[in-house]
Interface confidence: medium
Amino acid sequence: SSPTSSASSFSSSAPFLASAVSAQPPLPDQCPALCECSEAARTVKCVNRNLTEVPTDLPAYVRNLFLTGNQLAVLPAGAFARRPPLAELAALNLSGSRLDEVRAGAFEHLPSLRQLDLSHNPLADLSPFAFSGSNASVSAPSPLVELILNHIVPPEDERQNRSFEGMVVAALLAGRALQGLRRLELASNHFLYLPRDVLAQLPSLRHLDLSNNSLVSLTYVSFRNLTHLESLHLEDNALKVLHNGTLAELQGLPHIRVFLDNNPWVCDCHMADMVTWLKETEVVQGKDRLTCAYPEKMRNRVLLELNSADLDCDPILPPSLQTS
């Protein structure tokens, strides 16, 4: 999901170019300071160099660009705009570069950009138009196919006075630019909920990773439109139960594999439908590993081994009999 290339493809020697011939323009295959370049692999790596800005003198041939482990802080509009444009750039990895602000149009003028990884950056301010480039109600389609946004939640004291989930979703939905997105990774972001409209507007999704968040419920989330969805990662959340509507929608997706490990399933009367569904469905990977977390008497029981007699609810006491 992020640009890779083998280290052996990087040339270990380079010409010294000490020619006294008539003046020429700068060499097209020059490598920016603090970077490693392989024209054969069309790859530039500027990794762990404490760069504070994107190098301006990137070679035009670059197809895979790694800018990981730096101190970029801000990606301004047109951060990668060059003349001539970086027309070949297809995979851009900016993970772990201390970005806290990505401005509108940061990725404009990258006509071939298919993979973008912004993971492990504390994005306190992600512009709604970071990926769409404009505030038009319908923008030009983005070429992005993979968007990796794992662990982009900033520390609590750096968050703006607004919903982090809302900020991320606004950027995903602006201008309907990401209609072609096939992979979206949003793991480890402390998401408490998934805004209901987000998935409906990303109809091309094949892979969705929401693992290691704090999702309590999927009641208001619709998967119905995601007819191409192949994998849905919901491991390590706070899910208590999946209700009938969600179960039916997941069952109706032709290619889906769902991952549900390490959720605190509540094995009471509300779990009956899910247990029945689990016993019949093929869509849940590792379903034999799912265990109850609550109530205490059910802890560590395997969901697939439960029957309806196990799944009871304490009777609701009338108000006059309730204690404080």
């Epitope: 010294f16 020619s19 020429q24 323009p25 700068p26 060499l27 603090l34 490693e36 003198d57």
Partner: antibody, heavy 120, light 111 residues
Framework: EVQLVESGGGVVQPGRSLRLSCAAS????????MHWVRQAPGKGLEWVAY????????YYADSVKGRFTISRDNSKNTLYLQMNSLRAEDTAVYFC?????????????WGQGTTVTVSS | DIVLTQTPLSLSVTPGQPASISCRAS??????????MHWYQQKPGQPPQLLIK???NLESGVPDRFSGSGSGTDFTLKISRVEAEDVGVYYC?????????FGGGTKVEIK
């Protein structure tokens, strides 16, 4: 033969300005990043500033940031260092040096240096 | 900033004998592919001259009695048989990140 010749050094009072030049010959100047490095009397080497081949990228040492400006004129094959708000601790021999196209290769050619003395 | 620590500070060598200078970086200056450490010789009254680039690559025109090795944080410059003309100060320098820094230098003298 690659040659780098610095000029413009001299004695200057604290707070004043000076502009150093480095004339390059024997190679295609516009293809190479260039650096300034200095050496205080009896001391070691200190990197000062860098400019990319097409003047699109600049880097500075913290000790000179905001006071010194590196520039170049590829049509004249010349590198410059504009030094403002000079301090006594800027007293040094200033060398210009060439970076190969691939930066993992160190500074392959150096000028003889020009001496800057900041004193009241 | 990356600090480069050179040892020893000075070295007195008999002609024909080997010499070794160490340079230790406060953090790694190597990628999986390359090392961004270089060695220079500076003779009295002259500018530095590049001897070894990228840890172990001999600069053209430099005698092959000079060699370099190392990766990560530990690097070594070796002179297999010291000659009288090798007197001077030797510096290591990294180009891993900004600012580039130099070691404090090692002074080589002839006994």
């Amino acid at each position: 033969e690659v040659q780098l010749v610095e000029s413009g050094g001299g004695v200057v009072q604290p707070g004043r300005s000076l502009r150093l030049s480095c004339a390059a010959s024997g190679f295609t100047f516009s293809n190479f990043g260039m650096h300034w490095v200095r050496q205080a009397p009896g001391k070691g080497l200190e990197w000062v500033a860098y400019i990319s081949s097409g003047s699109s990228t600049f880097y500075y040492a913290d000790s000179v940031k905001g006071r010194f400006t590196i520039s170049r004129d590829n049509s004249k094959n010349t590198l410059y260092l504009q030094m403002n708000s000079l301090r006594a601790e800027d007293t040094a021999v200033y060398f210009c040096a060439r970076s190969p196209a691939y930066y993992r290769y160190g500074l392959d050619y150096w000028g003889q240096g020009t001496t800057v003395t900041v004193s009241s | 900033d990356i600090v480069l620590t050179q040892t020893p500070l000075s070295l007195s060598v008999t002609p024909g004998q080997p010499a070794s200078i160490s340079c230790r970086a406060s953090q790694s200056v190597s990628s999986s592919t390359f090392s961004y450490m270089h060695w220079y010789q500076q003779k009295p009254g002259q500018p530095p001259q590049l001897l070894i680039k990228s840890s172990s690559n001999l600069e053209s025109g430099v005698p092959d009695r000079f060699s370099g090795s190392g990766s990560g944080t530990d690097f070594t410059l070796k002179i297999s048989r010291v000659e009288a003309e090798d007197v001077g100060v030797y510096y290591c320098q990294h180009s891993w990140e900004i600012p580039y820094t130099f070691g404090g230098g090692t002074k080589v003298e002839i006994k």
